[in-house]
């Protein structure tokens, strides 16, 4: 029995729970998901029982090995998986636990602009990047392009200070999770600040 194995999968994709055993006479292998039986295998008896019929088409054993492949992943497949190898040659079953995290492929992140001010020819605002559907474990970074050196900023909020007359800048939000990444539409500093250009002391949402 080894340490817990952490696995990551994407919605619609597949994941393989790796399992090896040198036991000669395996009587049965039992896979469970959050304490619910998933699959029972009897290598010598010749049978594989998939507890829930809807999972039958999703279960596979690559190259006829002990590892279990689960395909057509759904969000609610996330959880704890446990396997026990039972054999009369073992005093107690050989076990392994896995934690599966299933993530969605990220859609295009949405950018909103905070309160904007324009003082002394400098446009100051915040850009906030977020996912519309509240996806989990998303990491945001911002790329600022256009100055001599391109800059990166970590976090969903990007504070902007852009002076009229400077070369235009482009801001792009990058959203990442363990299985995918996506980019916001590029935002140009000049366009962003145009609304506040007429009134040097204006604020707008």
């Amino acid at each position: 029995s080894g340490p817990v194995k952490e696995l990551v999968g994407s919605v619609g994709g597949a994941v393989t729970f790796p399992l090896k055993s040198k036991v000669k006479q395996v009587d049965s292998i039992v896979w469970t998901f959050n304490t619910t039986p998933l699959v029972t295998i009897q290598p010598e008896g010749g049978t594989i029982i998939v507890t829930q019929n809807r999972n039958r088409e999703r279960v596979d054993f690559p190259d006829g090995g002990y590892s279990l492949k689960l395909s057509k992943l759904k969000k609610n497949d996330s959880g704890i998986y446990y396997v026990g190898i039972y054999s009369s040659s073992l005093q107690q079953p050989s076990t392994q636990e896995y934690v599966l995290h299933v993530y969605e492929h990220l859609s295009k992140p949405k950018v909103t602009m905070g309160l904007q001010s324009n003082k002394n020819g400098t446009c100051v605002t915040n850009l906030t990047c977020c996912m519309e559907h509240g996806e989990e474990d998303v990491i945001y970074t911002w790329k600022a392009l256009g100055q001599a050196a391109n800059e990166s900023h970590n976090g969903s909020i990007l504070p902007i200070s852009w002076r009229w007359g400077e070369s235009d800048m482009t801001f792009i939000c990058v959203a990442r999770n363990p299985v995918s990444r996506n980019f916001s539409s590029p935002i140009l500093a000049r366009k962003l600040c145009e609304g506040a250009a007429d009134d040097p002391d204006s604020s707008m949402v």
Partner: antibody, heavy 120, light 108 residues
Framework: QVQLQQSGPELVKPGASVKISCKAS????????MNWVKQRPGQGLEWIGR????????KSNGKFKGKATLTADKSSRAAYMQLSSLTSVDSAVYFC?????????????WGQGTSVTVSS | DIVMTQSHKFMSTSVGDRVIITCKAS??????VAWYQQKPGQSPKLLIY???FRYTGVPDRFTGSGSGTDFTFTVSSVQAEDLAVYYC??????????FGGGTKLEIK
């Protein structure tokens, strides 16, 4: 990748014995059952028996008791089958085939076959 | 020993057709049935094990089903390269494992 390479064809006289080999590569030879299967010309398949190279344990089809002896050598990663007291009904192609781990009775990799002809 | 019977020794079909090969066990073998394909001059190739589990790399036009004593092997849309002999085999519990007599699939 998994490969099973069998020895070449044999022409033997009635009453003689023959030993055919199956050299394995690309997988954990000691931990997988190796099967032997007979196929007479134009006929179906007949399971002879299997051996576990890790400890030499064998399971055989009673029909081949006294006819086929299965052995294995871990160091050379080879399985062997000796056929004794040969008669014309032993003329056949003999295959070695590896058992899958998940289903020990299902055979996923097969050798190319060894043709044994018994003729005086 | 358990006897596996494939009632059709030959089956003739056309490319694109659906073909069903049947196999009957002389006693209950649960779902412990494998299907093999053997092309002329070649070794058998495992397609299905435990009645319905497709082996890695086997095209999904090949499917297996059944339990107890009655089993079927289906090719949903026959291709020219499927010309072969198909064998069922029971791998239930204690050996000996036994094979059906084979069904030769011929392309019209």
């Amino acid at each position: 990748q998994v490969q099973l390479q069998q020895s070449g064809p044999e022409l033997v006289k009635p009453g003689a014995s023959v030993k055919i080999s199956c050299k394995a590569s690309g997988y954990a030879f000691s931990n997988s059952w190796m099967n032997w299967v007979k196929q007479r010309p134009g006929q179906g398949l007949e399971w002879i028996g299997r051996i576990y190279p890790g400890d030499g344990d064998t399971k055989s089809n009673g029909k081949f008791k006294g006819k086929a002896t299965l052995t294995a050598d871990k160091s050379s990663r080879a399985a062997y089958m000796q056929l004794s007291s040969l008669t014309s009904v032993d003329s056949a192609v003999y295959f070695c085939a590896r058992s899958t781990m998940i289903m020990t009775g299902a055979m996923d990799y097969w050798g190319q076959g060894t043709s044994v002809t018994v003729s005086s | 020993d358990i006897v596996m019977t494939q009632s059709h020794k030959f089956m003739s079909t056309s490319v694109g057709d659906r073909v069903i090969i049947t196999c009957k066990a002389s006693q209950d073998v649960s779902t412990a049935v494998a299907w093999y394909q053997q092309k002329p001059g070649q070794s058998p190739k495992l397609l299905i094990y435990s009645a319905s589990f497709r082996y890695t790399g086997v095209p999904d036009r090949f499917t297996g089903s059944g339990s107890g004593t009655d089993f079927t092997f289906t090719v949903s849309s026959v291709q020219a390269e499927d010309l072969a002999v198909y064998y069922c085999q029971q791998h239930y519990s204690t050996p000996p494992y036994t094979f059906g007599g084979g069904t030769k699939l011929e392309i019209k």
